[in-house]
């Protein structure tokens, strides 16, 4: 899943890890654009064995995962412009 | 070579515990992600449990939430599993074998010749 | 959780006969799928992963395919050493193995 917030007033990673998790292994994605008093673009994975991890932004698998749910979320339609969410 | 070897299955009785190693060669172990897998003729095969390259991250079926535990030692190129509470349907097969590769490539999947648990009075 | 509904659960065919076996998802598992082959009393060994990409090793008359929920197996020419039993693995969330498809010598 994977949800775009547009509201966060501040920066929420202190510190970003580019370590590989499979993609089997992640419950939900939330990206926070820069922005509202964040000046980077963040990106927290939720894990299904309930721990929470920063991830850079750069980090390859990670952008490769963007991508297919980029893809995935052309093809549905649109929903509200503050929150977009991708099974 | 790649070789993943198991030790540590036998019989238990219900509620007691075991230790299942599987010792590696023939690749960089502190590389690949890690995973158990058992086997029974009624339920086929089913994943277990799942490790992180470092050990810090450990992913687990729900029926051995809270009983299981995987661990590694890359330094010995080891892989763990501590079962605990044991059951009769934890009776199996128990398999070690590979994951994804640091940079999720997926190319190795080379499997232990596996261990056998029985749990039983 | 995701089930994968494999099948059939026994295939009897001959030497040369094309088979198929069949895996389906209970939700979409954007092709994240592997199949495996079992001989007795040995550990599984990867024929494909990703749907459709052959393992190094194994020999062309194996290829996958399938997309969304529904993924098969295909043998195009059966030889004396692919009876074996044959499974498959949903790699979208956690880890579901199929119940497995026992190929027998008709």
């Known amino acids: 899943v994977l949800e775009v917030y547009y509201t966060h007033l501040r920066c929420r990673c202190v510190q970003e890890s580019s370590v590989f998790i499979p993609r089997r292994f992640i419950d939900r994605i939330q990206i926070s654009p820069r922005g509202n008093g964040c000046p980077r673009k963040e990106i927290i994975v939720w894990k299904k064995n309930k721990s929470v991890v920063c991830v850079d932004p750069q980090a390859e698998w990670i952008q490769r995962i963007m991508e297919m749910l980029r893809k995935k979320s052309s093809s549905t339609p649109p929903v509200p412009v503050f929150k977009r969410k991708i099974p | 070579e790649v070789q993943l070897v198991e030790s540590g299955g036998g019989l238990v009785q219900p509620g007691g515990s075991l230790k299942l190693s599987c010792v590696v060669s023939?690749?960089?172990?502190?590389?690949?992600?890690m995973a158990w897998v058992r086997q029974t003729p009624t339920k086929g095969l089913e994943w277990v449990a799942s490790?992180?390259?470092?050990?810090?991250?450990?992913y687990y079926r729900d029926s051995v939430k809270g009983r299981f535990t995987v661990s590694r030692n890359n330094a010995k190129s080891s892989l763990f599993l501590q079962m605990d509470s044991l059951r009769s349907e934890d009776t199996a097969t128990y398999y070690c074998?590979?994951?994804?590769?640091?940079?999720?490539?997926?190319?190795?999947?080379?499997w232990g010749q596996g261990a056998s648990v029985i749990v039983s009075s | 959780d995701i089930q994968m509904t494999q099948s059939p659960s026994f295939l009897s065919a001959s030497v040369g006969d094309r088979v198929t076996i069949s895996c389906k998802a209970s939700?979409?598992?954007?092709?994240?799928l592997t199949w495996y082959q079992q001989k007795l009393g040995k550990a599984p060994k990867r024929l494909i992963y990703?749907?459709?990409i052959l393992q190094t090793g194994i020999p062309s008359r194996f290829s996958g395919s399938g997309s969304n929920t529904d993924y098969t197996l295909t043998i195009s020419s059966l030889q004396p050493e692919d009876f074996a039993t044959y499974f498959c693995?949903?790699?979208?969330?956690?880890?579901?193995f199929g119940a497995g498809t026992k190929l027998e010598l008709k």
């Open positions: 074998k590979t994951e994804e590769d640091y940079d999720g490539s997926y190319v190795m999947d080379a």
């Open positions: 023939g690749f960089t172990f502190s590389d690949y992600y």
């Open positions: 490790i992180n390259y470092d050990g810090g991250d450990t």
């Open positions: 939700q979409n598992i954007n092709k994240e």
């Open positions: 990703n749907t459709n």
């Open positions: 693995l949903q790699q979208s969330s956690l880890y579901t």
